[in-house]
Each structure stands twice: as C-alpha cells, then as structure tokens.
C-alpha cells in the first residue's frame, strides 16, 4: 500500500507560492502534532494487548538506532533541515505502522484514525518545510533516510518496532515544539 | 460552505423501523467519513454510527449495534440511517455531522437535525 | 466505556465575567477531548479539540486546558450571546462519549 508519505529529493521547483506565515503554520503543526503524540503512543501500546502494557520500557523504550538528529540550539536553517529529515523518516514509519496495523487490527477505529492524522499533519509539514527551506535558504536537495520496513518481520516484531517508534516520535515531537 | 440536511424523522412504534437521510453540499462528500450523533429529550449527547469516506467501514456503540445501519452513496451526496428494533430510548433528535478532517474524531459540522419519537 | 461527567448542570455568571466549565474523564484521556457550545434551538457548534486547540473562527475568549482526566473550558469575558449548554467530548477511543452538559446562565 501507498506509504502516507512519499519522499522526494528536494528541489526548489516549488509549483506554489508559500503559505503567508510559513513559520508560524510550522510552529502550529508541530503543536498539533505534540498535543496528539502521547494518546497516539498510548492508544497503540493498549491494542497490542500484552506484553506491551506492562513492558513498556523493554518493548517501547525510544531505543530507534537509525533516528536523524536534531539540535535544537542550531540556526533556523540547520533546524530546519534536521525537522525536514526526521518528518520524512516519521512519514514512512509511520506508514508500515499503519499497514501493518490495519491487518493486526482491524477493528481499531481510533488508533487508525490518529495515526492517519498524524500521517495527514505530516504531509502538510514536510510541504512547509520544504517551501521555508527553498524560498528562504535555497536548499534544493536534502539527503534522507527512510524508517525499517517491516514487511518481512513476525507479527511480534512488527509490534515492537512500531511502539519503540511511536516512543521515539512522543519524546522527539515535544522536543521539535519547543525548539520553534 | 458545508451544508448538511437531515430527513426522514417522525413517529415511530416500538419494534419498528425508520431510514433516515442526510443530504450533503458545499464539500466534496466522498472524502470525508461520516458520522452520526443523537440528542435525547433529556438532551445527553450520544454517538451513534460511523461510516468510512468509501462505505467500507462502519462502527457502532454498543446501545445500537445489530439494531441500526449506516450507509452513504456517494454519487447522491447521501447519508443514510437505517434504524430497525426501535426502543422508547432511542427518541431523540438525530444530527448528521461531518467531521473538519478526513481523520478527525471531534463533530465540526452538524446539520439541523431530525427528530424521531418512538412511542406507542 | 470512558465516563465523561460535568458535575455542573447549571453555572450562573454576569456579562464581563470569567466563568470556567469542567469536565471529568473516568481515565486518562491524553488530552483528547473536544468542547462544544449549543445555543438554545441550535444545533450544536465545536469550539475546542485536543483539549486546547481552537477550531476555525471561534473567538480567543475561549480556552481549553487540562490534561490526563481533568478537563476545562473558560470563557474570559462572558458575553450575553454565550448563554447556552456546554458539552464536553472524549475522542480518546470508540465509542465516543460526551459530558452530561453544563447549561450557562446570564445573570
């Protein structure tokens, strides 16, 4: 299925003028997405059903090896580019998550919900981003990474890597908010 | 601007059955879910039925499951409640409401209601 | 089912006035609660999401706060237009479920 982001090179071909207040719709998004971020985290953990409750630090501490970084006392366009990398890579994780839950269960109408808000919230971030970094820095090309592809992982596994993910968005999101 | 109108209210016997409409305009109706949500006399607010934008999916309380059916055609801009077994409970003024994002679960947009009074 | 409760049926306050209309979750909802304002013959009308965010063209004299299953809408300058029933939401998890209401007065 189509991953709710899909990753371009970032070129500074932008096809529409930026939004009025770029930076203040960015700060808005990131609210949007912190204020979200702990019942999305939560929600996921309960309909994984046990072990998850009860091992949260071993099944989804934010343990995510391959994470881009951020430095939140950086310039804007140092920022800027570190958010740009890290919403590409919450883009496709959160995609396999959302794949992978619709088959794991499928009758979880909320969690299905925000994590497709969450994915919809993105999407309009990366674009922000995006326009910010090329009209105001000229930043045509932003080397990325991509978040695991779980497609070939056991049921158990897929879960895992979907909680220690969404830890890692909960604990890196309110770090993003603050640092706008 | 978002225009929902609901339909097909009145008097209804206990076991009885009623199907409801809401006709949508001003947005494009197929990419958004859809919900329903009722008022009772005592005026408790209760969510009622969800429906996915494609029709696929449909959720329900537990007070109205295997009782009432939500559908949507969406060439016709339609919403639909199909209510069968009605209870004297289930009176109340019931809202069509569409939600402010596709993936929302808070009511942004209510039409004027309907009510259906179940009553001998 | 998560149990929203509005101990408050009825508030009285005066125009001018700061009024603040609670709302109680039976378990944490994380901030996942809407407010909605109905005016008398009207339908219903969504002021807040996520506890705290105002919706399209709802005045800033409307506020939401709270957090784990306490839950607040204050309203900074009551306006005689604001007599209504307040309804809180969870949008927590299925099934979706709303406070009792809280009716304010204008003295």
């Known amino acids: 299925s189509p991953l709710p982001i899909t990753p371009v090179n970032a070129t500074c071909a932008i096809r529409h003028p930026c939004h009025n207040n770029l930076m203040n719709q960015i700060r808005s998004q990131l609210a949007q997405l912190n204020g979200s971020a702990n019942a999305l985290f939560i929600l996921y953990y309960t309909a994984q059903g046990e072990p998850f409750p009860n091992n949260l630090d071993k099944l989804c501490g934010p343990n995510v090896t391959d994470f881009p970084p951020f430095h939140a006392n950086g310039t804007e366009k140092a920022k800027l580019v570190e958010l740009y990398r890290i919403v590409v890579y919450l883009g496709t994780s959160l995609g396999n998550i959302t794949r992978d839950q619709k088959i794991l269960n499928p009758s979880a109408l909320s969690l299905h919900s925000k994590l497709n808000a969450t994915a919809d919230i993105l999407r309009g971030l990366l674009s922000n981003v995006l326009c910010r970094l090329c009209s105001k820095y000229h930043v045509g090309h932003v080397d990325v990474t991509y978040g695991p592809d779980t497609s070939g992982k056991d049921v158990f596994q897929k879960k895992k890597l979907g909680c220690q993910l969404l830890g890692k968005y909960k604990e890196t999101i309110a770090v993003l908010a603050q640092a706008f | 601007e978002v225009m929902l109108v609901e339909s097909g209210g009145g008097l209804v016997q206990p076991g009885g059955s009623r199907r409801l409409s809401c006709a949508a305009s001003g947005f494009t109706f197929s990419s958004y879910p859809m919900f329903w949500v009722r008022q009772t006399p005592e005026k408790r607010m209760e969510w009622v039925a969800y429906?996915?934008?494609?029709?696929?999916?449909?959720y329900y309380p537990d007070t109205v499951k295997g009782r009432f059916t939500v559908s949507r055609d969406n060439a016709k801009n339609t919403l639909y409640l199909q209510m069968s077994s009605l209870k004297s409970v289930d009176t109340a003024i019931y809202y069509c409401?569409?939600?402010?994002?596709?993936?929302?679960?808070?009511?942004?947009?209510w039409g004027q209601g309907t009510l259906v009074t179940v009553s001998a | 089912d998560i149990v929203m409760t509005q101990s408050h049926k009825f508030m009285s306050t005066s125009v001018g006035d700061r009024v603040s209309i609670t709302c109680k979750a039976s378990?944490?909802?994380?901030?996942?609660v809407a407010w909605y304002q109905q005016k008398p013959g009207q339908s219903p009308r969504l002021l807040i999401y996520w506890a705290s965010f105002r919706h399209t063209g709802v005045p800033d004299r409307f506020t939401g706060s709270g957090s784990g299953t306490e839950y607040t809408l204050t309203i900074s300058r009551v306006q005689a237009e604001d007599l209504a029933l307040y309804y809180c939401q969870q949008h927590y998890n299925t099934p979706y479920t709303f406070g009792g209401g809280t009716r304010l007065e204008i003295k």
């Open positions: 429906i996915s934008n494609g029709g696929d999916s449909t």
């Open positions: 378990q944490d909802v994380s901030n996942a």
């Open positions: 409401v569409r939600p402010s994002a596709r993936y929302d679960e808070w009511f942004a947009y």
